[in-house]
Interface confidence: medium
């Protein structure tokens, strides 16, 4: 086949700095790409929480459609895929369940969406029948096996790879799942989670002996895997992929994100092959677009692009707007109704907050420890027990006294700035720091003061800042029987806390300095309402998990009264 | 392909400290732990401590806390390790060597190795 | 620390036949899932070379005559059947916990 000259749209070949021909005999592939996209699908903030100022905001589904029907108009081979996680992250999700990516991706015709670890929040039900059951275009996975009588009931409905006709070509879609999803979201005993790179290997081959001869990786596994990926499974041309939420750009960039390499990242196989690497960010604030040239035998010649962003400049589209205003109805009924009942004043305030133990802060730790149960193992009760959380994100309490009725509306005065409950893995010794730190200017009513789960920490705030943590023990994970033991500094140990403290935000640098894994989580709101709808009646008490001592507890008293009159003083005349 | 090199020998005098490099190609320098093991002849291995390549953040060994230090140049692609104050029991083969990605960094690519006499 | 103690400490095995080399821990390296136990094979005068990763993965370009399983405590690497080729010394290495250790290493003859 003779391919078209590329018609790219004129700025964005000059934003490329060239503008770049294919080579004779050359095939060209435009990809365009998602990931990571968390349930946004109206438009954002420039922070990826809720639009304000409409005529600032960026993304959603309308807004994407429109740019994805323009790069269709205008190039001749183009492919819309997407690297996972659609599900988890706003009301959208809490109400529709997934029945809202199916009909939104469907609506913006994708042509293959890789499964990311949050597609299983909702437990495999939960993805087979919104998701799996109604989407009209390939799911996949390759490392991904079910067993028992799961097999049977899920057979055909994800797909290892996928070929697809592309012009007069073909392209091999390979799909894959970070292995650790058993840990991060619910897919229950019945599906093994493969090692990626073992998994793909012979399904790379098998399109191989098909006679496919492009082929893209696409998935959801972080960065360094995709990157591992690219380096070590023969055959893949492209990879695509999402979880680690990495912006990747060429030039200057148009927002506030700080690429983290070049786009594409290209990766040195190990047989030699330029492998050009991708991801989009996340929550749908870019479009992923990269063009591809190949030769005649399908090897890669050149690889070129740039995420585009998707700001207001980009007009939403009129359809897909009017689908989404229709849907919109039921949310806003939702966030009004109940969701549970307190009987007890739940203590939101920044003069407890950032001070003391505070009840709302042992509720949404205990959220966070309950929403992370995974019984994967029998050695271990739990994989996670411990959960920090900065008192400076508690925005508000919820009084008891309206009949207890507690909405996601109130939670949203909580936990009003749209952030996620992670999960990262620590050395004790990280862990230490971050303790230290939280009490390092106590009685400035600052944001860092550390509300806890699964821990017990004593400070002695008589003694110099970086030496006040006294005592400090965590709740064992490997034990029938949980109960508290001293942190170890060189183990390594899960904490489940605010995306805001993985990276860093507080002045927590120490934790993402250190941190040695970190996998994001399920929408903080979420993560509450969900734990309230469950217990139904709630009553979350102060209990010791945060004690205050010195040498002699005369002095420890005195010490604390005169601090705290001090930090009511300092409040009242903010 | 990915390589890491690193010198054959260093011979240097008790009480003295050496530096030994190790270059690495064939891959993003960055995206890769590196570690340093040592072995004495005849013996087994010994892992000394690791370095983050694109931040310089490290997790020693107690044991070489005082012994090792570890250090990266990124625009060279080479992580170093100095060891210091020196006696017979640092000879030995010091290996430096790639870690994978997450928290299952098994060591898939090492170097040579650099051995170590200390001798007056 | 973690100690890990690998036995037997030297073995002798026929062309053709089986290798087992155990490999026990002072305390679980399993991490509520998948165990950080890696095998390694160093023949003499050379750099150790990744065999076996995470307990049971084979490396790429190892030859599936080797096997790895085991979790918890107990980890063994099985080698069937044995080639001229595989006279080295192996050593199993942990990671659950700093600082990473490796066993004291088994020698392995072909007879």
């Known amino acids: 086949m003779c391919p078209r000259a590329a018609r790219a749209p004129a700025t964005l070949l000059l934003a490329l700095g060239a503008v770049l021909w294919p080579a004779a005999g050359a095939w060209e592939l435009t990809i365009l790409h998602t990931n990571d996209v968390h349930s946004r699908l109206e438009q954002t903030s420039e922070d990826s929480s809720k639009c304000v100022n409409a005529s600032r905001c960026m993304g959603g589904v309308a807004r994407l459609f429109t740019k994805v029907q323009q790069i269709r108009r205008a190039e001749p081979n183009v492919l819309l895929l997407d690297a996972g996680d659609q599900y988890q992250g706003t009301i959208w999700f809490t109400v529709y369940k997934g029945a809202e990516v199916a009909h939104f991706m469907n609506a913006l015709r994708y042509d293959a969406m890789a499964l990311g670890n949050h597609e299983f929040d909702n437990g495999v039900e939960g993805l087979i029948e919104p998701l799996l059951k109604e989407a009209k275009f390939p799911i996949l996975s390759a490392n991904i096996k079910a067993k028992g009588p799961l097999a049977s009931q899920i057979s055909g409905l994800y797909l290892p790879y996928k070929v697809l006709p592309v012009g007069d070509e073909v392209v091999g879609i390979v799909g894959y799942t970070s292995k650790e999803t058993p840990f991060l979201s619910n897919p229950g005993t019945n599906l093994v989670f493969e090692d990626e790179i073992t998994a793909l290997q012979p399904e790379v081959d098998k399109l191989k002996t098909l006679n496919v001869n492009k082929i893209i990786a696409l998935g959801h596994s972080g960065f360094e895997m995709d990157k591992l990926i690219a380096q070590k499974v023969r055959g893949v041309d492209v990879v695509v992929g999402g979880h680690s939420n990495t912006f990747l750009y060429t030039g200057n960039p148009p927002s506030k994100e700080v690429p983290a390499g070049k786009y594409p990242f290209i990766v040195t196989s190990d047989d030699g092959r330029k492998v050009p690497v991708v991801q989009a960010y996340a929550f749908g604030k870019y479009l992923g677009y990269l063009k591809i040239e190949f030769d005649e035998r399908g090897n890669v010649i050149s690889s070129h692009g740039n995420p585009i962003l998707l700001n207001s400049s980009i007009p939403e589209d009129p359809s897909i707007k009017a689908d989404i205003n229709k849907w919109r109805i039921k949310l806003d009924n939702y966030s009004t109704q109940e969701l549970g009942k307190t009987i007890v004043y739940l203590d939101g305030s920044s003069q407890s907050c950032r001070f003391r133990e505070c009840n709302m802060g042992n509720l949404i730790c205990d959220a966070m420890i309950n929403n992370n149960l995974r019984h994967t193992d029998e050695m271990f009760w739990n994989h996670v027990s411990m959960c920090i959380l900065n008192g400076g994100g508690i925005r508000s309490p919820i009084d008891e006294r309206n009949n207890g009725t507690i909405t996601w509306e109130n939670l949203a005065a909580v936990l009003p700035f749209g952030g996620t409950f992670d999960l990262v893995q620590l050395k004790g010794s990280t862990l230490k720091k971050a303790f230290e730190h939280s009490v390092h200017r106590y009685g400035q009513s600052t944001g860092e003061f550390l509300q806890v789960g699964g821990i017990h920490v004593v400070y002695d705030l008589s003694r110099k800042p970086g030496d006040r943590v006294v005592k400090l023990d965590v709740l064992c994970t490997k034990c029938r029987v949980p109960s508290y033991d001293p942190l170890k500094m060189d183990e390594v140990y899960k904490v489940i806390l605010p995306n805001f403290l993985a990276n860093g935000g507080d002045g927590f640098q120490m934790i993402k300095d250190e941190l040695l894994r970190h996998d994001s989580g399920d929408q903080d709101i979420n993560v509450v309402s969900t734990y309230i709808s469950k217990m139904k009646v709630i009553y979350p008490a102060v209990e010791g998990r945060i004690k205050f001592s010195t040498g002699s507890h005369c002095h420890g008293s005195f010490s604390l009264i005169f601090l705290s009159l001090w930090a009511v003083i300092f409040v009242l005349y903010q | 392909q990915v390589q890491l090199q690193q010198p054959g020998t260093e011979l240097v005098k008790p009480g003295a400290s050496v530096k030994l490099s190790c270059k690495a190609s064939?891959?993003?320098?960055?995206?890769?732990?590196m570690h340093w093991v040592k072995q004495r002849p005849g013996q087994g291995l010994e892992w000394i401590g690791n370095i983050n390549p694109s931040n310089g953040g490290t997790n020693y060994n107690q044991k070489f806390k005082s012994k090792a230090t570890l250090t990266v140049d990124k625009s060279s692609n080479t992580a170093s390790m100095q060891l210091s104050s020196l006696t017979s029991e640092d000879s030995a083969v010091y290996y430096c060597?790639?870690?994978?990605?997450?928290?299952?960094?098994?060591?898939?690519?090492w170097g040579t190795g650099t051995t170590v006499t200390v001798s007056s | 620390d973690i100690v890990l103690t690998q036995s037997p400490a030297s073995l002798a095995v026929s062309l053709g036949q089986r290798a087992i080399i155990s490999c026990k821990a002072s305390q679980s390296v399993s991490f509520a899932g998948p165990s950080l136990m890696h095998w390694y094979q160093q023949k003499p005068g050379q750099q150790p070379k990744l065999l076996i990763y995470r307990t049971s993965n084979l490396e790429a370009g190892v030859p599936t005559r080797f096997s790895g399983s085991g979790s918890g405590t107990d980890f063994t690497l099985n080698i069937h059947p044995v080639e001229e080729d595989d006279a080295a010394t192996y050593y199993c290495q942990q990671n659950r916990e700093f600082p990473w250790t490796f066993g004291g290493g088994t020698k392995l003859e072909i007879k």
């Open positions: 060597a790639r870690g994978d990605y997450g928290y299952d960094w098994y060591l898939d690519v």
């Open positions: 064939g891959y993003t320098f960055t995206s890769y732990w």
